[in-house]
């Protein structure tokens, strides 16, 4: 009997009530694979949804969002209201982007302007609610008298290779440490052994925390109201 059902093609179902005959899917239903015992109900595109592809006996309907809305989720399972550029959708509706943020689309959230200084650049064009800032050349490049061409790398002075500089720095550090320990050694004569032990231990002792510090952070941030902008 199972073999009979497996012969039923897509667009039909294996009808148990009719000796497992392959019956066509009834209106507004479909089966996308063969051997199905039931047909699935077609998706209905209603309300904010509009039909992109009609349902057939072998495939489900596909929906899109009506004008003023955009799809969210797999296979456009949700429609979200558009906002204008320079706005974002919050719990209270479409709100303008706060200063320092922008949104160049009708969907999504407001994002912070690019911080040009992080890349060592300057702001060429100021940002708006709808547009990000445009970063230009670094402030140093804009200083008077600076040529637009890249200056040649300065020639290294003879006798100052990185290896020599590193060796001199290392030698100086070792000498300083030796001097430090010699001074401490002589101080043993003047001070007791216990006192010297205290000197060594002191920097590594963990200070006792106050209750407030153990709490983590003492300052509490006020609850931000959705859609409000910080001044």
């Amino acid at each position: 009997l199972q073999d009979l059902c497996s012969n039923c093609p897509a667009g039909t179902f294996c009808d148990n009530n009719r000796s497992q005959i392959c019956s066509p899917c009834p209106p507004n239903s479909f089966s996308s694979a063969g051997g199905q015992r039931t047909c699935d109900i077609c998706r209905q595109c209603k309300g904010v949804f509009k039909t992109r592809k009609e349902c057939s006996s072998t495939s489900n309907a596909e929906c899109d969002c009506i004008s003023g809305y955009h799809c969210l989720g797999a296979e456009c399972s949700m429609c979200e209201q558009d906002c204008k550029q320079g706005q974002e959708l919050t719990k209270k509706g479409c709100k303008d982007c706060c200063f320092g943020t922008f949104n160049d689309q009708k969907r999504g959230i407001c994002r912070p302007w690019t911080n040009c200084s992080l890349d060592g650049k300057s702001v060429l064009v100021n940002g708006t609610k709808e547009r990000d800032v445009v970063c230009g050349p670094s402030p140093a490049d804009l200083s008077p008298g600076a040529s637009s061409a890249t200056p040649p790398a300065p020639a290294r002075e003879p006798g100052h290779s990185p290896q020599i500089i590193f060796f001199l720095a290392l030698t100086s550090t070792v000498v300083l440490f030796l001097l430090f320990f010699l001074v401490l050694r002589f101080s043993v004569v003047k001070r007791s052994r216990k006192k010297l032990l205290y000197i060594f231990k002191q920097p590594f002792m963990r200070p006792v925390q106050t209750t407030q510090e153990e709490d983590g952070c003492s300052c509490r941030f006020p609850e931000e109201e959705e859609g409000g902008c910080e001044l």
Epitope: C45, S77, L89
Partner: nanobody
Framework: EVQLVESGGGLVQPGGSLRLSCAAS????????MSWARQAPGKGLEWVSG???????YYTESVKDRFTISRDNAKNTLYLQMNSLRPEDTAVYYC????????????????WGQGTLVTVSS
């Protein structure tokens, strides 16, 4: 079968009031979030207001302080009290389930009524 039937629309003068009703059947109304949407002539569909099963209410900016959404779970009915009506409130008003609980967002499983026309004109 899920059914949502709106009523209460009609012609009203600017500054006037109307109360829309939406009779729900075929699902557990008391545990469902509900919403109102509207479509002005030649314009797109606009999310107007929503109410959670627990009673929390949400409104679009343009109707705040003028419209009030409410529900009567015993009667399986959703209401929209509209006061200080303006000509720009003229639209077909739809009642819909609101499974996403998100402002301006509906899902494919949400159900819609056929709508009731509200005309604000002198």
């Amino acid at each position: 079968e899920v059914q949502l039937v709106e009523s209460g629309g009609g012609l009203v003068q600017p500054g006037g009031s109307l109360r829309l009703s939406c009779a729900a059947s075929g699902f557990t109304f008391s545990s469902s979030a509900m919403s109102w949407a509207r479509q002005a002539p030649g314009k797109g569909l606009e999310w107007v207001s929503g109410i959670y099963s627990g009673g929390s209410t949400y409104y679009t900016e343009s109707v705040k302080d003028r419209f009030t959404i409410s529900r009567d779970n015993a009667k399986n009915t959703l209401y929209l009290q509209m006061n200080s009506l303006r000509p720009e409130d003229t639209a077909v008003y739809y009642c819909a389930t609101w499974g996403t609980l998100r402002f301006g967002v509906w899902a494919e499983y949400d159900h819609w009524g056929q709508g009731t026309l509200v005309t604000v004109s002198s």
